[in-house]
């Protein structure tokens, strides 16, 4: 995971948020786990980052991800209170200058180094779900969510007429 030398960890002072154009409305550090409480971990292998879904040993620290929350101008159908009404999008960054990105051609989720402003592939619409879970929908491909497939993160197409509570697209955020 990101405890390895040479990989900068997040400190109390989060990312410098002075991005040109769109700017986040709040930021926080959290660990990401699946509905079944498996941890999402990140490892440096052959000069590239791999993302794993695994059971963590008890003494092993969970990897933290910087979540930056952005408001979309599109109205949210979920808040339902007429006050904030805006959809939330997030970017997820497990280490400085690297962000999770959707690769729609390969149906995969990858970690890429990129500069701001971030590409649309790095933005995911945040959905609140039951059981204190969330799901992440690709901004670039509505109906496609980050999900778990064969112990890896993948992009999974979800039919809106079916149950969006499908366990493999549900994630938990914890400090």
């Amino acid at each position: 995971a990101f405890g390895i030398s040479g990989v900068p960890k997040y400190t109390r002072a989060l990312h410098d948020s002075s991005i040109t154009g769109i700017s986040p409305i709040t930021e926080s550090l959290a660990s990401l786990s699946t509905y079944n409480d498996q941890s999402i971990t990140f490892a440096l292998e052959d000069e590239s980052y791999e993302i794993y879904v695994e059971d963590l040993k008890k003494d092993k620290k969970k990897d933290k991800v910087l979540l930056s929350y952005y408001e979309s101008q599109h109205p949210s159908s979920e808040s339902g209170d007429g006050v904030d009404g805006k959809m939330l999008m997030v970017t997820l960054s497990p280490t400085k200058d690297f962000w999770l990105q959707a690769n729609n051609k390969e149906h995969s989720v990858e970690l890429h180094k990129c500069e701001k402003p971030l590409p649309d592939q790095a933005f995911f619409v945040l959905h609140n779900r039951s059981f204190n879970c969330v799901s992440f929908e690709c901004k670039t491909d509505p109906g496609v969510f980050i999900g778990v497939k064969d112990n890896h993160l993948a992009l999974i197409k979800v039919d809106y007429s079916e149950n969006l509570g499908s366990e493999n697209i549900l994630f938990k955020l914890s400090e």
Epitope: E27, S79, K86, L126
Partner: antibody, heavy 123, light 108 residues
Amino acid sequence: EVQLVETGGGLIQPGGSLRLSCAASGFTFSFYAMSWVRQAPGKGLEWVSAISGSGGSTYYADSVKGRFTISRDNSKNTLYLQMNSLRAEDTAVYYCARTIHGIRAAYDAFIIWGQGTLVTVSS
Amino acid sequence: EIVLTQSPGTLSLSPGERATLSCRASQSVGINLSWYQQKPGQAPRLLIYGASHRLTGIPDRFSGSGSGTDFTLTISRLEPEDFAVYYCHQYSQPPPFTFGGGTKVEIK
């Protein structure tokens, strides 16, 4: 209409206990982190405590840690603040407040505030 | 605990003038900072969140700027209803969250 209504305030002797309630309506309560903020007469705002949407994470100001307990009942759309070992310096109007966005975590500004309930600790 | 220091404590201005309120954090809070207006006998009212995002319905004479440790609330042209107390509030991770001591904007 989105609304927060605090109840439970009153006059209490030092060392006593009181439980404040905050009834929420007009929004999906479990989606939002909630906080208690207080304001002593003629003074500024002081954040007291916060709780995540699920109730799984709670946070306290140092001044109330070990004496106050925040909790929520999502089935009743209600937030609570149990206050024990009350002191004269706890005298204040207590507001409950809701975060802007349904992030469930506590890291957000407060958009909805109740009207406040006055707690007076005096012998 | 992160300490927020607001200055000045009191600002005496006339309607139509520009008000500049400062909030300094004892350590970085990123962009996790908001501004509230409070009038006597009322609950606080959110104006700005995420350091620079104006809440829907708040007049555009209110603007926020800054990140890290130094933040500013600017009221470009004071209206009679703007005379009130203004508080900054940080909600950076991890808690405790804190409020600044407030700046009173009064009529000169």
